[in-house]
């Protein structure tokens, strides 16, 4: 998260750091009691790693007592999801059993209205991704309100010249932004899910290529299929 | 498949105004910027404007700000482009063109013409 | 307002030729966030512009491979390897990095 600040402790129970091999690799969101949401692209390179699910965290290192780290049963990436697009880049975590629920984890209830957040909503963003363009990874939960960006504009040949379809949305990225690491992650309008950090190479920070998150009200078909 | 129609051209005389149509269709229209691009006889393509079709916010040529003016109407996904006080240089093919990727789709053109 | 200056203003070739056309802008076209916005069109006659070349180098999907850009800061490039009979056209350049976007006067390619 850039431009971002420490997020209150446990005050998102529903944020999950996707974990390979033991390392942070992206983020996720609780969105039932055995499975978790994030972006398939964070898992194109983990063929041969341990996926793991960390729910209940502030700190990535220090010990606390809602932390707890899951394996994952089943990895459930969108099927239309291509290394090379950033269409459809959605990924359902199925833990090896049910979270253990508590003050600092919970389920975040998501979107199903397939209906555009008006532009200027302001959202909120978490992660555990870096913090400056130097690469800094953070040990504790980073957080950011950021206003969403209506289509159009985030259409245009300046910013992401029609890339961004009725599947995505954008939120505004001047200095404060999503960033690597933080792919997977939940945007949050409202007390509601309403997006999911795409991954990729996207610069961070820079006003004109705004942040890009898939809108999980489009997918509801499938993570009710999914989750069934 | 994106399509672009524009209608509204003719003959108008001079001091003249009209109303030009785009009207959209194979996309959702409040995705995408829409240009207006016109091109006189035997001449080059030159650059009238933009409107984002959710916040109807407009960008003008210089040029053509005080006399042409773009609206909207997103229940058709049609864009307006009003030319008043007409003069024979206005003459020209006009076109409006998506913004997305770059100006990939284009209307067949209207033909203006401004003559007494 | 950003001038774009093409040459030649037009051309004689025969099929098979190599084309290049030039065009130069008043000043960089190197937007704030690092691209450059320099894109190609072809013309037809009582035809709308079509897209050939965004982003100084890049192909627009479908636009064959004997189609090339290049060229950097002020001065660029329009490429055709190996000219084809639906080629002959009149070619347009066009800076979208700074408002007014600009289109450059046109090459017109004839066939000799």
């Known amino acids: 998260i850039l431009g971002g600040r420490e997020a209150e402790a446990h005050a998102r129970p529903y944020m999950a750091s996707v974990q390979l091999n033991g390392a942070h690799l992206c983020g996720g969101v609780l969105v039932a009691e055995q499975w978790v949401l994030s972006a398939a692209h964070c898992l194109e390179d983990a063929a041969d790693g341990k996926v793991q699910v960390l729910l209940g965290a502030h700190s990535l290192s220090q010990p606390e007592p809602s932390k707890r780290l899951y394996d994952v049963l089943r990895a459930v990436p969108h099927p239309d999801s291509q290394p090379d697009t950033i269409d459809h880049d959605l990924l359902l975590l199925q833990l090896s059993e049910k979270a253990t629920l508590g003050p600092a984890v919970r389920p975040l209830p998501w979107q199903r209205v397939d209906r555009d957040v008006a532009p200027g909503t302001l959202c909120d963003v978490a992660g555990w991704g870096i913090v400056n363009h130097a690469g800094r990874r953070p040990d504790s939960l980073q957080h950011v309100l950021l206003p969403v960006l209506d289509r159009a504009t985030c259409n245009r040949r300046t910013h992401h010249d029609g890339a961004i379809t009725e599947r995505l949305m954008c939120a505004e990225s001047n200095r404060r932004d999503s960033c690597k690491g933080d792919s997977g992650g939940p945007l949050v309008c409202g007390g509601v899910l309403e997006g999911v950090v795409t991954s990729g190479s996207r610069v961070c920070g820079n006003r004109k290529k705004p942040g890009i998150y898939t809108r999980v009200a489009s997918y509801a078909a499938w993570i009710d299929s999914v989750l069934a | 498949e994106v399509q672009l129609v524009e209608s509204g051209g003719g003959l108008v005389q001079p001091g003249g105004s009209l109303r030009l149509s785009c009207a959209a269709s194979?996309?959702?229209?409040?995705?995408?910027?829409m240009n207006w691009v016109r091109q006189a006889p035997g001449k080059g393509l030159e650059w009238i404007g933009d409107i984002n079709p959710v916040t109807g916010d407009t960008d003008y040529n210089a040029d053509f700000k005080r006399r042409f003016t773009f609206s909207l109407d997103t229940s058709k996904s049609t864009a307006y482009l009003q030319m008043n006080s007409l003069r024979a240089e206005d003459t020209a093919v006009y076109y409006c063109?998506?913004?997305?990727?770059?100006?990939?789709?284009w209307g067949q053109g209207t033909l203006v013409t401004v003559s007494s | 307002d950003i001038q774009l200056t093409q040459s030649p203003s037009s051309l004689s070739a025969s099929v098979g030729d190599r084309v290049t056309i030039t065009c130069r802008s008043s000043q960089t076209i190197v937007h704030s966030n690092g691209d450059t916005y320099l894109e190609w069109y072809q013309q037809k006659p009582g035809k709308a512009p079509n897209l050939l070349i965004y982003k100084v180098s890049n192909r627009f999907s479908g636009v064959p491979s004997r189609f090339s850009g290049s060229g950097s800061g002020t001065d660029f490039t329009l490429t055709i390897s190996s000219l084809q009979p639906e080629d002959f056209a009149t070619y347009y350049c066009?800076?979208?990095?700074?408002?007014?976007?600009?289109f450059g006067q046109g090459t017109k390619v004839e066939i000799k």
């Open positions: 066009f800076q979208g990095s700074h408002v007014p976007v600009t």
């Open positions: 194979g996309y959702s229209f409040t995705s995408y910027y």
């Open positions: 063109t998506r913004e997305g990727p770059s100006f990939a789709y």
